[in-house]
């Protein structure tokens, strides 16, 4: 997995006037990490994991980053000619990455109303739009506006892709995210569903990185997919990710079933608790 | 390559007990169960039980509770079945397996003879 | 428990021949029926796994099919060393058990 570093900043539009506030928030490897949700922005790390990477800095920097950009993104909101009344939104999603052979990419996406019209390769500072009309319109509209306005020239494309992977180097000499593997916690429980039957689900929580094998067995032999339920692995506000796995099975066979975790070259296997005992928790 | 060693043949007396081993390689080894199964000599094969090597956790066949003990050694990936209070009707081919996963007894060892005879 | 009937003990066919082996559950098993081959020299064998899933390794000339009770294992073109006994096992249901194995003979 690559590192990465992402902003995702939303600002609002009103009956055809953008409205002062913005919304901004900050990934590092796919982790919720900085926030600014107010009128005037304050960079907020988000947990004690974005703390310990940030260390004793004040966020200054990051604040004034994403003031600017809010500012930017307000201004091109309001070039937008096609504002109907209500509310609107725009977004911009900017990507950068490094790649365990050291190459990066860097890339940023527009997104009205929560669809994608315009994408760039900030490396080759190619624009790529959707096919549909709309998409169209509101790309060019927004091109012609960035054209228009002197920040926007080649040299800054390529500041905004150095700025980006300067950041991210700076967060990952703090050491905390670099290469790190934190283990799950698994733990299994059991509900009643249908009279003989019960539901057996196994949770798999603050873990790092997101990549996991979580499976249900039966006598040793993976149940196949169309007989097993999975939830998205998601991140849990702690620098960590969560997720789980559920299958139905018949009461009293509860022994024949395993479930199976594998997680950064480590595997364990985690019995269904029998009879009263609700969780079986356990950390190998 | 996945492969399961077991100890060589064994002759004991009735009522005295025999521990077969079962060394597994070319895996890693918590990772899959470990099945027992029993042929008599020139009869059907017959499954003891297994055993998840991660945690020790065992099931058996009926038939083979109170007869057969499983158990592992994870420091040498070896499975072992103790067997107790052999009769003549214990006389027989034992073979371990595991599995790969998908299928159940996908690799076997080569078998022990346990003789009882007095 | 399930039993597995293989009603032919034994069997003779010529090389190249298309053999077919049955063997039947004593209830519903699923699909859940694997097949194994026991060489003379007793060196077991999976074959087949969940009806008709090929083991890897296994020749092509091998296939499996079957549903409900009734299961079987075809060898399209007979070789020499496929001289052994055939085992059918259901995993549907504790305690796992095998039918009484079908020994393949050369004419």
């Known amino acids: 997995e690559p590192h990465s570093l992402r902003y995702n900043l939303t600002v609002l539009s009103g009956d055809g006037s953008v409205q002062s506030g913005f919304l901004a928030e900050v990934h590092l490897d796919g982790q919720p990490f900085l926030r600014c949700d107010r009128q005037k922005c304050r960079a907020k790390p988000q947990g004690q994991w974005a703390e310990d990477v940030l260390g004793n800095k004040t966020w200054d920097r990051e604040t004034r980053d994403l003031t600017g950009n809010g500012k930017d993104l307000r201004m091109t909101l309001a070039h937008i000619k096609d504002q109907k009344e209500g509310l609107h939104s725009l977004q911009e999603i900017r990507v950068c990455e490094i790649h365990e052979d050291n190459s990066t990419r860097s890339s940023q996406h527009f997104y009205y109303d929560g669809e994608l019209f315009l994408s760039q390769n900030l490396e080759t500072e190619e624009w790529t739009m959707p096919q549909s009309s709309r998409a169209q319109t509101l790309a060019m509209n927004v091109r012609n506006f960035l054209k228009e306005d002197a920040m926007k020239t080649k040299t800054h494309y390529h500041a905004m892709h150095a700025d980006c992977l300067q950041e991210l180097r700076r967060y990952l000499k703090s050491g905390v995210v670099l290469r790190r593997t934190v283990p799950p916690m698994v733990n299994v429980t059991r509900s009643e569903a249908s009279e003989g039957n019960i539901t057996v689900t196994c949770r798999a929580s603050g873990f790092y990185p997101w990549n996991i094998t979580l499976s249900w067995r039966q006598d040793g032999v993976s149940l196949s997919h169309d007989t097993q339920q999975w939830g998205d692995v998601l991140p849990d506000g702690n620098g960590t990710y969560q997720t789980w796995v559920a299958t139905r099975i018949c009461q009293g066979e509860e022994q024949r079933f395993t479930c199976y975790m594998e997680h950064s070259g480590n595997h364990s296997t985690h019995p269904v608790p029998s009879g009263k005992v609700l969780v079986l928790q356990s950390h190998w | 390559e996945v492969q399961l060693q077991q100890s060589g043949p064994e002759l004991v007396k009735p009522g005295a007990s025999v521990k077969v081993s079962c060394k597994a390689s070319g895996y890693a080894f918590t990772k899959y169960n470990i099945y027992w199964v029993k042929q008599s000599h020139g009869k059907s094969l017959e499954w003891i039980g297994y055993i998840d090597p991660y945690n020790g956790g065992t099931v058996q066949n009926q038939k083979f509770k109170g007869k057969a003990t499983l158990t592992v050694d994870k420091s040498s990936s070896t499975a072992y079945m103790h067997l107790n209070s052999l009769t003549s009707e214990d006389s027989a081919v034992y073979y371990c397996?595991?599995?790969?996963?998908?299928?159940?007894?996908?690799?076997w060892g080569q078998g022990t003879l346990v003789t009882v005879s007095s | 428990d399930i039993q597995m009937t293989q009603t032919t003990s034994s069997l003779s066919a010529s090389l190249g021949d298309r053999v077919t082996i049955s063997c039947r559950a004593s209830?519903?098993?699923?699909?859940?029926l694997n097949w194994y081959q026991q060489k003379p020299d007793g060196t077991v064998k999976l074959l087949i796994y969940y009806t008709s899933r090929l083991h890897s390794g296994v020749p092509s000339r091998f296939s499996g099919s079957g549903s409900g009770t009734d299961y079987s294992l075809t060898i399209s073109n007979l070789e020499q060393e496929d001289i052994a006994t055939y085992f059918c096992?259901?995993?549907?249901?504790?305690?796992?058990?095998f039918g009484s194995g079908t020994k393949l003979e050369i004419k």
């Open positions: 209830q519903d098993i699923g699909n859940y």
């Open positions: 397996a595991t599995t790969d996963g998908y299928s159940l007894f996908t690799y």
């Open positions: 096992q259901q995993g549907n249901t504790l305690p796992f058990t």
